[in-house]
């Protein structure tokens, strides 16, 4: 399971697509900045085993996929870029799922990191709530796009875990 390299390449492609998706100048959106509290400290203070890292990354990508698969998201972004981005995320999810099966066997998917998965879910709930409060405005989506790019690059500790042997 050569996940570190494939995940890194797909992650980079997804980030490039996300960067290209911007429709309005972010300079007009400064006042819409918001504190989403990505659980950075929790991740940084933990040495993830490979199976743990896979399941937390899976949750992050799944939540991102869900966020950008809504009707409101379709209205906000250029359709062909959004489709490419979603496809890239879907491929990442498939890679991670295949790796979990290969690493621990389908029945043994680790349940030891519910706290981290819950932290990721709450983080995405805050993002969804913000978008609702801002009525899915173009600036709100710009802020969310910037935040997702940041959280993708923040998950370096998780990616280190992908290189570990359990």
């Amino acid at each position: 399971c050569d996940l570190p390299q494939t995940h890194s390449l797909r992650n980079r492609r997804a980030l490039i697509l996300l960067a290209q998706m911007g429709r309005i100048s972010p300079f007009s959106c400064l006042k819409d900045r918001h504190e989403f509290r990505f659980p950075e400290e929790e991740f940084d203070g933990h040495q993830f085993q490979k199976t743990q890292a896979i399941s937390v990354l899976h949750e992050m990508i799944q939540q991102t996929f869900n966020l950008f698969s809504t009707e409101d998201s379709s209205a906000a972004w250029e359709q062909s870029l959004l489709e490419k981005f979603s496809t890239e995320l879907y491929q990442q999810l498939n890679d991670l799922e295949a790796c979990v099966i290969q690493e621990v066997g389908v029945e043994e998917t680790p349940l030891m990191n519910e706290d981290f998965i819950l932290a990721v879910r709450k983080y995405f709930q805050r993002i969804t709530l913000y978008l609702m409060e801002k009525k899915y405005s173009p600036c709100a989506w710009e802020v969310v796009r910037a935040e997702i790019m940041r959280s993708f690059s923040f998950s370096t500790n998780l990616k280190k875990g992908l290189r570990r042997k359990d």
Epitope: A19, P26, D32, R33, E35, F36, E142, R150, S153
Partner: antibody, heavy 121, light 107 residues
């Protein structure tokens, strides 16, 4: 270690052109905006403008719009501030600083050492 | 443009004193305010961001408060290295604007 390193001091004559630089290292250059700040001798800080190096989108203070041009070359992690025709009143220290863009993070957390521009006939 | 007004423009204080600098915005900027310290011949240094968050590596004697239009920077016990000029800056909207500065001098 995050660093912004600016080009050296310049002495120019009125009417001459100039381009000063700010090279970023130790972080993802395209993940942050780069702002430029002027400080005239013995005076306070004035924000001039900002660039998003990922796509070279810019925003200027109305006081500096049309007076200067901000650009960037992301392939070499460098932002630029340029004048096509300098005036004596452009004599100042110019600083670059990084900005987190739309992210909830500290503004202007790292600064360049400054470039002193002197314009005199 | 949002105008930022600092007061006082200068003050004299002794080591150990509690020092307070205020900054007023011409319109509400929520909590989008930063404080910087600048020493002669040096680049500014970020102290406080988003009105009250202490920047990493900055001593805890520095604190910030306020929201809307009125903000305060407090130095609880002035140290010799704190004699400098302090600037507030709004990061609510473009154009970004700074206060005119407050020079803290030795009494």
């Amino acid at each position: 270690e995050v660093q912004l390193v600016q080009s050296g001091a310049e002495v120019k004559k009125p009417g001459e052109s100039l381009k000063i630089s700010c090279k970023g290292s130790g972080y993802s250059f395209t993940s942050y905006w780069i702002g430029w700040v002027r400080q005239m001798p013995g005076k306070g800080l004035e924000w001039m403008g900002i660039i998003d190096p990922s796509d070279s989108d810019t925003a200027y203070s109305p006081s500096f719009q049309g007076q200067v041009t901000i650009s960037a070359d992301k392939s070499i992690s460098t932002a630029y501030l340029q004048w096509s025709s300098l005036k004596a009143s452009d004599t100042a220290m110019y600083y670059c600083a990084r900005h987190p863009g739309l992210n909830w993070a500290p503004d202007f957390d790292y600064w360049g050492q400054g470039t002193l521009v002197t314009v005199s006939s | 443009d949002i105008q930022m007004t600092q007061s006082p423009s200068s003050l004299s204080a002794s080591v150990g004193d509690r020092v307070t600098i205020t900054c007023r915005a011409s319109q509400s900027i929520d909590g989008a305010l930063n404080w910087y310290q600048q020493k002669p011949g040096k680049a500014p240094k970020l102290l406080i961001y988003f009105a009250s968050s202490l920047q990493s590596g900055v001593p805890s004697r520095f604190s910030g408060s306020g929201s809307g239009t009125d903000f305060t920077l407090t130095i609880s016990s002035l140290q010799p290295e704190d004699f400098a000029t302090y600037y507030c800056q709004q990061s609510f909207d473009f154009p970004l604007t700074f206060g005119q500065g407050t020079k803290v001098e030795i009494k």
